[in-house]
Amino acid sequence: RAPRCRELPAQKWWHTGALYRIGDLQAFQGHGSGNLAGLKGRLDYLSSLKVKGLVLGPLHKNQKDDVAQTDLLQIDPNFGSKEDFDNLLQSAKKKSIRVILDLTPNYRGENLWFSTQVDSVATKVKDALEFWLQAGVDGFQVRDIENLKDASSFLAEWENITKGFSEDRLLIAGTNSSDLQQIVSLLESNKDLLLTSSYLSDSSFTGEHTKSLVTQYLNATGNRWCSWSLSQAGLLTSFLPAQLLRLYQLMLFTLPGTPVFSYGDEIGLKAAALPGQPVEAPVMLWDESSFPDIPGAVSANMTVKGQSEDPGSLLSLFRQLSDQRSKERSLLHGDFHTFSSGPGLFSYIRHWDQNERFLVVLNFGDVGLSAGLQASDLPASASLPTKADLVLSTQPGREEGSPLELERLKLEPHEGLLLRFPYVA
């Protein structure tokens, strides 16, 4: 008799794929024309990335460091009107993209939380949550919570409001902290909070260190749902050497939890790579005309247009990974097991019941390596086969779909492999 199927876990929408942050509307749209009406026209692009949520803003009125001139209920007219926002929500909903609003109060100022008036600001946030939930947003983000006195209790209160409206709404908190204890203490009082931090960027970027960071994090947070990013707001290129970008994309999409990216991560956009750009919000490179001030500053392979036409580009890899992440049970909610492999490597398996299983092998090193996969430390339910099919490699030159012998597996420098193999009873 066939074995019984394992019961599927409850899946919230943010469990099903990546979140995409647009912290600066103008920089994202380029040509100084960034507003909500224009963003509506970019939703097809977001759909093509198969992201599940858009983390937007802040958009509210905020006069730098002035509490009295900060109104979390009002959209800054430079971004558009409330009705523009409503129309964006409707269009996004039709494309199955959820919209999360960043309500970090003093986003134009020095201290994002007006440190001297925390209580009055916290009350403003409470009112804003109620207001924007009524308006149809799917969740909220607040950043720099390490600068918020008594952050845990405020977050608990805000989460209660958000979840009280609907269990389907999400609260994201961001911190610059990379300290695991601090992160765990913030998570403890909030059962469904998604926390973005600098935890993974506090790394020597070796396979062993990354493996230890990931396993420590998962052990410390127990069976709660995680999010994975390198920071609460920045671009991957600000934290990673260029040669590891593809590897990290593969890792973020295949770890158990929600991957969170910033606009431009999918094309390897660099902070301040072009003259005169602000470090925190570089202009999105849609095509070669995205930076008209300096002719020739942008080459085609740096742009969305150029990379869309190149199957070997970072953008094409992002789309492939996002597609796999959103449709494969083992990647959606599968169990996660790391196992021993060669030095410099980080390898793990994702599996769910009788569904196709996925093997991820990441070479963080500068030299080619034998995988040296040792399945002895895997549980019986997750044993390795002798061969697995290649879903994708982060490097060109391998034929997708080809079977690879795991015992003889070799990886190029900085290569990551995503392999699949069937469940065998």
Epitope: N35, A37, Q74, I75, P77, G80, S81, K82, E83, D84, F85, D86, N87, L89, Q90, K93, K94, F131, Q134, A135, G136
Partner: antibody
Framework: QVQLQQSGAELAKPGASLKMSCKAS????????IHWVKQRPGQDLEWIGY????????DSNQKFKDKATLTADKSSNTAYMQLSSLTSEDSAVYYC?????????????WGQGTLVTVSA | DIQMTQTTSSLSASLGDRVTISCRAS??????LNWYQQKPDGTVKLLIY???RLHSGVPSRFSGSGSGADYSLTISNLQQEDIATYFC?????????FGGGTKLEIE
């Protein structure tokens, strides 16, 4: 509270133009578009178009593209609709309306209507 | 353009009755369906938005339901002040369009 106050009834000759107004109060004028809706006697409602007072951007029903011109004056919180080349088909009540504070497109606030009669 | 059809143009009912008015769209409108009440003096009020959500200040005897292309408005305990014409409107796609209206009268 939110109010939309429309200008009074108009009698106009065929071929002429006229401009009606809709003065908004009780909210920040630039936050919401002003929509215009037509209703001929004993008939259903027809959406004409909207103006975004914040940017002056307009979008309208193809059917009214050459008939209605929408403008707004932020300083007086007033939206205007000008109808040109009037014919008896333009005799109707014209309403201005505004969305509510929720994302589904629906008109939560309506003016009292301006009756336009086109007659020689 | 999306066509909105209210098949019943007028309806007679007694006070206290439960009355249902239907509306059909020419295509799926993803629940972006609103109901309005127009009194004989021309005053227009929003009753229901997004298929089933009651606008603030509207009595709970009004309710809405439906999905895809078919929607309905129900008045559960008809009152004298409910005598009016009821219009449906789709907010799914520009241009927004309205149904022809259903005039409700007391028997």
């Amino acid at each position: 509270q939110v109010q939309l106050q429309q200008s009074g009834a108009e009698l106009a000759k065929p071929g002429a133009s006229l401009k009606m107004s809709c003065k908004a109060s009780g909210y920040t004028f630039t936050d919401y578009y002003i929509h215009w809706v037509k209703q001929r006697p004993g008939q259903d409602l027809e959406w004409i178009g909207y103006i975004n007072p914040n940017s002056a951007y307009t979008d309208s029903n193809q059917k009214f593209k050459d008939k209605a011109t929408l403008t707004a004056d932020k300083s007086s919180n007033t939206a205007y609709m000008q109808l040109s080349s009037l014919t008896s088909e333009d005799s109707a009540v014209y309403y201005c309306a505004r969305k509510g504070h929720f994302y589904a497109p629906s008109f939560a606030y309506w003016g009292q209507g301006t009756l336009v009669t086109v007659s020689a | 353009d999306i066509q909105m059809t209210q098949t019943t143009s007028s309806l007679s009912a007694s006070l206290g009755d439960r009355v249902t008015i239907s509306c059909r769209a020419s295509q799926d409108i993803s629940n972006y369906l609103n109901w309005y009440q127009q009194k004989p003096d021309g005053t227009v009020k929003l009753l229901i938005y997004y298929t089933s959500r009651l606008h603030s200040g509207v009595p709970s005897r009004f309710s809405g339901s439906g999905s895809g292309a078919d929607y309905s408005l129900t008045i559960s305990n008809l009152q004298q002040e409910d005598i009016a014409t009821y219009f449906c409107q789709q907010g799914d796609t520009l241009p927004y369009t309205f149904g022809g209206g259903t005039k409700l009268e007391i028997e």
